[in-house]
């Protein structure tokens, strides 16, 4: 059907509460495009009737609420005047009651559910609530270990919980709760967040430092093979993940079908006070579509990118 397939990261979600996913893929969705959602390669589009539990709302797919059986691969097809892209989103729904146990055992939780507070600082946690305009969100309540948070050091501001003078006791399991109203019906949204505490920067804390790349461009000829290392220093006891992403998606997921661009196996060298980690990205064959795209190396909260660019023409050859 001439549509280019793009594979997004897995989303791990909680059952029995609303969920929405916006089909945006800049620069594709910045112009005049039509967006249609499908489930599991079905030829029948997701309903646009707002009374349906699962329906399309402009560019969003909206679940009111999400149920355990909704797990699966959803596709949104973005059609422009002379282009077509099919974005695949893998949704995994789990039954979870935040107060039963720690959410730490869940696989592949995104950064939205794992946040860091910095010791001694005035810091904040964010309640990530992504919904279309048709959904009205009420005030947010915050809980720690299932008790509503109160006290001088805590202030709720919009979608954030401000924590002044962070202490070691502030680590633990948090949840933010809001009431969502859609078409006169109310639903509860509850997001669990595992919070860790880090000390100040340097090797005393757990903010990794990306030595290379340094947010720069690399000249590379079309069709060549390219390997780029990401070098990271971090504490010996760190729990940070290191990976390469493009368009906010792990490169291995993004290029899942073609396997043209892959992340390498991580290696590390141990020093007295820290470790030096290396994880590379391999372009088996550089294509036109790779130019101008930021390929991001992530290491915990740290990021750095490379952008491929065509070499300037060498006029001496003429």
């Amino acid at each position: 059907d001439g549509c280019k397939d793009i594979f997004m990261k897995n989303e791990i979600l909680s059952a029995s509460q609303p969920f929405a996913f916006n089909c945006t893929f800049p620069p594709i969705t910045s112009g005049e495009v039509s967006v249609t959602w499908y489930k599991n390669s079905s030829k029948i589009p997701v309903s646009k009737i707002i009374q349906s539990r699962i329906h399309q709302d402009e560019t969003w797919i909206l679940f009111l609420p999400m149920e355990w059986g909704d797990s699966g691969v959803y596709q949104c097809v973005i059609k422009g005047r002379d282009s077509c892209h099919r974005i695949h989103v893998n949704l995994t729904v789990f039954e979870k009651h935040w107060c039963d146990t720690s959410i730490g055992g869940l696989p592949n939780l995104s950064d939205e559910y794992k946040q860091i507070l910095h010791l001694g600082k005035d810091d904040s946690l964010t309640c990530h609530l992504h919904f279309p305009k048709s959904c009205v969100l009420g005030p947010i309540k915050w809980y720690k270990d299932c008790n509503e948070i109160k006290g001088e050091r805590f202030t709720v501001l919009e979608t954030r919980l401000l924590v002044s003078n962070v202490s070691a006791e502030d680590r633990g399991n948090y949840a933010c709760q809001a009431i969502l109203t859609h078409s006169g019906k109310q639903y509860e949204v509850l997001n669990g967040i595992t919070v860790s505490i880090t000390e100040r920067a340097g090797y005393g804390g757990s903010v990794p430092k990306i030595i290379y790349p340094k947010n720069h461009s690399i000249e590379v000829q079309l069709g060549t093979t390219l390997i780029v290392d990401c070098n990271v220093t971090d504490t010996k006891d760190n729990t940070n993940l290191r990976c390469w992403r493009v368009n906010n998606t792990l490169v291995d997921d993004y290029y899942d079908e073609s396997k043209r661009i892959r992340e390498g196996v991580e290696t590390h060298v141990s020093f007295r006070e820290h470790n030096l980690y290396t994880v590379n990205i391999t372009f088996l064959e550089v294509k036109m579509e790779d130019y101008g795209l930021p390929f991001m190396c992530h290491a915990g909260v740290s990021t750095a990118y490379i952008i491929l660019q065509l070499p300037a023409p060498d006029f001496r050859a003429y």
């Epitope: 005035d122 810091d123 904040s124 401000l162 100040r200």
Partner: antibody
Framework: EVMLVESGGGLVKPGGSLKLSCAAS????????MSWIRQTPEKRLEWVAT????????YYPDSVKGRFTISRDNANNTLYLQMRSLRSEDTAMYYC???????????WGQGTLVTVSA | EIKMTQSPSSLSASLGDTITITCRAS??????LTWYQQKPGNIPKLLIY???NLHTGVPPRFSGSGSGTDFTFTISSLQPEDITTYYC?????????FGGGTKLEIK
Amino acid sequence: EVMLVESGGGLVKPGGSLKLSCAASGITFSRFAMSWIRQTPEKRLEWVATISSGDMYTYYPDSVKGRFTISRDNANNTLYLQMRSLRSEDTAMYYCAIMITTGEHAYWGQGTLVTVSA
Amino acid sequence: EIKMTQSPSSLSASLGDTITITCRASQDISVWLTWYQQKPGNIPKLLIYKASNLHTGVPPRFSGSGSGTDFTFTISSLQPEDITTYYCLQSQSYPWTFGGGTKLEIK
């Protein structure tokens, strides 16, 4: 809507004193740390002072330490900056700002101009 | 005192371009870097806090990244209203220090 209104600026001779005020509305003033930040005629921004929400902690750069005093009146939603022994290099537009988290100055006043000149 | 070196001090770009401004700290500041925008005759406006977090209401074409000593501020698809001056501020340790500013101009 959050509003911050500074006052008290003006022309003063070197060695003189001024007291700046900043009246806040539209926010629970007592919950937030506050800062004074100035902008020199060359458009350089300089941090001048910060006070914690409960008035317990104050911080200054060496360039103003001992000469400037930041204080607050939470009952009246007002922030102050007492400036003594003023120097020509203190000439600047002085802004008060509400700090949401460390260094995150989300709301600023329109500023009050302080000119130190003989 | 931590010195913040902001570069370039001025930058010419065309509308629709992607531009990058960098701030380098003289020592490790973790993620405690804030980016501000100031239009002529106006007050500074918060854009990004803690190196990479977008302030409420700021368009997603603005982004920040980095940690430690090297930080980047990016505007993708430059708009006419973005042609102004940008500052970084480190708040890892006292005294807090600003970068010298970057003035954007139309090419």
